[in-house]
Interface confidence: medium
């Protein structure tokens, strides 16, 4: 392990389209990958009229956009599908939206997914 890096070995897994995609619906996903690559957790969700609908959660491949992020936070301004990634076991259990582009004081929208 590299000092200061949060190793990701497993992530919360969820797939809203599990029947269509023929996967598990929920679980804990072990993260695999090449030894020289970093591994991350991710979450994707939609905001339908103020209601949070989780799309997917799980492991994510080595992605510079996820480096050294201990929290899963989406910063893009009003995407159609929200995405965040992070490093550390099960770091995608909670995810938040902090838009960077807003002029006004951003508000935290932390989300803890409820089991289906």
């Amino acid at each position: 392990a590299i000092l200061g890096r949060s190793e990701t070995q497993e992530c919360l897994f969820f797939n809203a389209n599990w029947e269509r995609d023929r996967t598990n619906q929920t679980g804990v996903e072990p993260c695999y990958g090449d030894k020289d690559k970093r591994r991350h957790c991710f979450a994707t969700w939609k905001n339908i009229s103020g209601s949070i609908e989780i799309v997917k959660q799980g492991c994510w491949l080595d992605d510079i956009n996820c480096y050294d992020r201990t929290d899963c936070i989406e910063k893009k301004d009003s995407p159609e599908v929200y995405f965040c990634c992070c490093e550390g076991n099960m770091c995608n259990e909670k995810f938040s939206y902090f838009p960077e582009m807003e002029v006004t004081q951003p508000t935290s929208n932390p989300v803890t997914p409820k089991p289906p």
């Epitope: 389209n17 269509r20 996967t23 695999y32 956009n65 995407p79 599908v81 929200y82």
Partner: antibody, heavy 120, light 107 residues
Framework: EVQLLESGGGLVQPGGSLRLSCAAS????????MNWVRQAPGKGLEWVSN????????GYADSVKGRFTISRDNSKNTLYLQMNSLRAEDTAVYYC?????????????WGQGTLVTVSS | DIQMTQSPSSLSASVGDRVTITCRAS??????LNWYQQKPGKAPKLLIY???SLASGVPSRFSGSGSGTDFTLTISSLQPEDFATYYC?????????FGGGTKVEIK
């Protein structure tokens, strides 16, 4: 080094059957989802089927559903595609490809392909 | 199913040129967008995954950008070994779908 080696292709008559195999080495086979992708002569890539790490879940393209069956034998590090009721439009090079995660984030390693020709 | 539309379908360029290929999804696919390179008679090779991440061994002249529905693959300075066909692919949902391909030819 990750290696995927397909075999089992050949010439078959319409309505016939073939079984493709993909021998995997260089990685922990039972930790990854696997896919079949095909490419008709001079055409683009078409995803055919996938199977999760333990064989518990499978998916198929509409064009092959009910005719093709994907399976795996983790003790032999081998992926299979049983193709029945073959049609002329199934003629293609068939590739096996490794899915990078449970949800196939990307197909990170591919075999060299095996040619299936369906013709009378 | 999610449709992936690539443009152009082919292009002619010279060594050293900057080349841009675009890919559009029929609905938002967040960051579930990958690019592959295929040379004649060879298997496809993963080039870029998750929109921007270079696969192992891929030169830094390749880059990806975009999010949602519109994505771009850029080759900053085309090299002789880059003449090939490039495909985008979404892994947001099943069935996995590919773009029609962009053939990069020598001018």
């Amino acid at each position: 080094e990750v290696q995927l080696l397909e075999s089992g292709g050949g010439l078959v008559q319409p309505g016939g059957s073939l079984r493709l195999s993909c021998a995997a080495s260089g990685f922990t086979f039972d930790s990854y989802s696997m896919n079949w992708v095909r490419q008709a002569p001079g055409k683009g890539l078409e995803w055919v089927s996938n199977i999760n790490y333990n064989g518990g879940y499978t998916g198929y393209a509409d064009s092959v559903k009910g005719r093709f069956t994907i399976s795996r034998d983790n003790s032999k590090n081998t992926l299979y595609l049983q193709m029945n009721s073959l049609r002329a439009e199934d003629t293609a090079v068939y590739y096996c490809a490794r899915g990078a995660n449970w949800h196939d984030t990307a197909l990170d390693y591919w075999g060299q392909g095996t040619l299936v020709t369906v013709s009378s | 199913d999610i449709q992936m539309t690539q443009s152009p379908s082919s292009l002619s360029a010279s060594v050293g040129d900057r080349v841009t290929i675009t890919c559009r999804a029929s609905q938002s696919i967040s960051r579930y967008l990958n690019w592959y390179q295929q040379k004649p008679g060879k298997a496809p090779k993963l080039l870029i995954y998750a929109v921007t991440s270079l696969a192992s061994g891929v030169p830094s002249r390749f880059s990806g950008s975009g999010s949602g529905t519109d994505f771009t693959l850029t080759i900053s300075s085309l090299q002789p070994e880059d003449f090939a066909t490039y495909y985008c692919q979404q892994s947001y949902e099943s069935p996995l779908t590919f773009g029609g391909g962009t053939k990069v030819e020598i001018k």
